[in-house]
């Protein structure tokens, strides 16, 4: 067999509402997946598990199955969506992303994804990780790529 | 020049209320939130609270709940804390407290980056 | 809570030394550390935020290290004025919580 490539190529928008009570932030995140079969049967995408973390804590999960069937030598892309909340302990962010004298609301996010292919009842696992930037302050497309993470730092002005 | 002006010493009787009020000058005062946060005598700093000036929105210290209330006067830029039901055990220095977020293209952090003269506040019969 | 255990309490130095402060956060809290100075009869004063960005009018002689759980506050080159109270603070997560202080006297 020759190799599945999985290809996390960033975020694709991410939708954000507030809790002003409970001082919590929602922000949907959809992010998008090349997967390359470079084999010469088809496989199948059993299922894809993301979970996104802010500040090594663990803010959103997502679990999608029985995705799609990738043909011979094909490749498709897969955008999937993960629910998350900013809240309790970290409800110090709701200024961050709401205060109007703050003029960039980015926050960075690690995004995990792990990808279950199957073929001829043989499962693999692939994973990804990476850091992507997501303006907690209102809702935004992306252009794809365009979220990858760098980093400079200024006090609020 | 940023100032956060604090009120005078307080002497006040076991089961009495207090209100410390906390100037702010010399900044828009809805650019930033306010952190109170208590020095017990010979002792380290404790965070109360924090409010938002926008909304008044506020998120409290567990073991101040039901103890502080955080409240603000956006007409006269000021910061208000209220200690009720108050024992010997809250006689401290009580401090309000600039908070800023640090930024570049993303959320880098926060600090207290100015702080009230702090406000004694003393419970005896 | 996050607990920071912050060492030592006490400190004796001359003017022209070199001193470390050090704190130690009871779960790993990125590098969301604030560093502060109390004296008597002035405001409390920012010296570091965000681990180890100095700032602004603070002079270079302070300077912080560290992350996860593991942080420092270095003094080269003591100045008369550098004798007072030092504090870290974590801002990870809700409640903020501050170490016990290190109070730094002139030997």
């Known amino acids: 067999p020759r190799s599945i490539d999985v290809k996390y190529i960033g975020v694709k928008s991410a939708y954000v509402s507030y809790d002003v009570q409970k001082r919590t932030i929602y922000l949907n995140i959809t992010n998008t997946l090349n997967i390359t079969n470079n084999n010469y049967y088809s496989v199948e995408v059993e299922n894809i598990t993301a979970q996104v973390q802010f500040s090594k804590t663990v803010i959103g999960k997502a679990r999608l199955n029985n995705i799609t069937i990738i043909g011979p030598l094909d490749m498709k892309q897969i955008d999937y969506t993960v629910p998350t909340v900013i809240a309790e302990e970290m409800s110090y962010m709701y200024d961050f992303c709401t205060l109007i004298s703050i003029k960039v609301h980015n926050i960075v996010l690690m995004m995990q994804v792990t990808v279950t292919t199957t073929y001829f009842g043989h499962s693999e696992q692939i994973s990804q990780e990476r850091y992507q930037y997501v303006d907690c302050g209102r809702n935004t497309t992306y252009q794809l790529g365009q979220s990858e993470y760098l980093n400079v730092l200024q006090p609020q002005q | 020049e940023v100032q956060l002006q604090q009120s005078g010493p307080e002497l006040v009787k076991p089961g009495a209320s207090v209100k410390i009020p906390c100037k702010a000058s010399?900044?828009?005062?809805?650019?930033?939130?306010m952190d109170w946060v208590k020095q017990s005598p010979g002792k380290s700093l404790e965070w109360i609270g924090h409010i938002n000036p926008n909304d008044g929105g506020t998120f409290y210290n567990q073991k101040f709940k039901g103890k502080a209330t955080l409240t603000v006067d956006k007409s006269s830029s000021t910061a208000y804390m209220e200690l009720r039901s108050l024992t010997s055990e809250d006689s401290a220095v009580y401090y309000c407290a600039r908070w800023v977020y640090y930024y570049g293209i993303s959320y880098e952090g926060g600090a207290m980056d100015y702080w009230g003269q702090g406000t004694s506040v003393t419970v005896s019969s | 809570d996050v607990q920071i255990t912050q060492s030592p309490s006490y400190l004796a130095a001359s003017p022209g030394e070199t001193i470390t402060i050090n704190c130690r956060a009871s779960k790993s809290i990125s590098k969301y550390l604030a560093w502060y100075q109390e004296k008597p009869g002035k405001t409390n004063k920012l010296l570091i935020y965000s681990g180890s960005t100095l700032q602004s009018g603070i002079p270079s002689r302070f300077s912080g290290s560290g992350s996860g759980t593991d942080f420092t506050l270095t003094i080269s080159s003591l100045e008369p004025e550098d004798f007072a109270m030092y504090y870290c603070q974590q801002h990870n997560e809700y409640p903020w919580t501050f170490g016990g202080g290190t109070k730094l006297e002139i030997k």
């Open positions: 010399g900044y828009t005062f809805t650019d930033y939130t």
